[in-house]
């Protein structure tokens, strides 16, 4: 885990300062409003299953 | 550290009723989705139900073989989880463990608390 | 509902082996960038522990002898050289879709 203004998180994760620690990319699939997915790539729209399982 | 302290479990005859707590520390409760996963007596884990968010209007999941039965809460403002399991089975009987996680993988788990359900 | 199958079941091998476990999923669990596959590390009478989620990300303190990789539906875990305290049983899990379902796991016993 790192603070803002250090180096940047590893790949594949992105800072959240909501958490204040870095988080996975990935789970913006689940998670698509978080914070740190502004911080990823693409940040894939979470499909109807995890709406409307 | 991260705490997640299970209670509620015991015997319990076949039909009946019980409430298991999980009292849950050292990270954003309100931010983490929670579950409840069973493991019978020398088999594999079991996920058994799901609570999401305040923001997803604390949207809940549960496996078929719960459904109806069973039904999962949170009190944010106590920083616990609950489950209510009603109409209980001999198939029920099993270690419940809590979990929480940001998203996909189970980061945090209890001890356990071991529901017997037996006449 | 996603099957998902791991092999072994059970396992003999000694301090300083290289075991490998594989996860079958019944149908994809990936993305093009992420897969949704996680492993778990139990031992006797303990909760679970999350060793790798997203199929190779190793989990803070997790040591670097534990490896993942894999996508679509074939997945290992990987122990380049086994110690007294990796003797565990070890399930995979999937969070594709509800339900998440674990693999029957994979017993890690002392040859």
């Known amino acids: 885990e790192q603070a803002p203004g250090t180096a940047p998180c590893s790949r594949g994760s992105s800072w959240s300062a909501d958490l204040d620690k870095c988080m996975d990319c990935a789970s913006c699939r689940a998670r698509p409003h978080s914070d740190f997915c502004l911080g990823c790539a693409a940040a894939p729209p979470a499909p109807f299953r995890l709406l409307w399982p | 550290q991260v705490e997640l302290v299970e209670s509620g479990g015991g015997l319990v005859q076949p039909g009946g009723s019980l409430r298991l707590s999980c009292a849950a520390s050292g990270f954003t409760f309100s931010s983490y989705w929670m579950s409840w996963v069973r493991q019978a007596p020398g088999k594999g884990l079991e996920w058994v139900a799901e609570i999401r968010l305040k923001s997803d209007n604390y949207a809940t999941h549960y496996a078929e073989s719960v459904k109806g039965r069973f039904t999962i809460s949170r009190d944010d403002s106590k920083n616990s989880l609950y489950l209510q399991m009603n109409s209980l089975r001999a198939e029920d009987t099993a270690v419940y463990y809590c979990?929480?996680?940001?998203?996909?993988?189970?980061?945090?788990w209890g001890q356990g608390t071991l529901v017997t359900v037996s006449s | 509902d996603i099957q998902m199958t791991q092999s072994p079941s059970s396992l003999s091998a000694s301090v300083g082996d290289r075991v490998t476990i594989t996860c079958r999923a019944s149908q994809s669990v990936s993305t093009s960038s992420y897969s949704y596959m996680h492993w778990y590390q139990q031992k006797p009478g303990k909760a679970p522990k999350l060793l790798i989620k997203?199929?190779?990300n190793l989990e803070s303190g997790v040591p670097s002898r534990f490896s993942g990789s894999g996508s679509g539906t074939d997945f290992t875990l990987t122990i380049s050289s086994l110690q007294p305290e990796d003797f565990a049983t070890y399930y995979c899990q999937h969070s594709w879709e509800i339900p998440y379902t674990f693999g029957g796991g994979t017993k890690v016993e002392i040859k």
């Open positions: 997203y199929a190779s």
């Open positions: 979990t929480g996680y940001y998203a996909d993988a189970m980061d945090y």
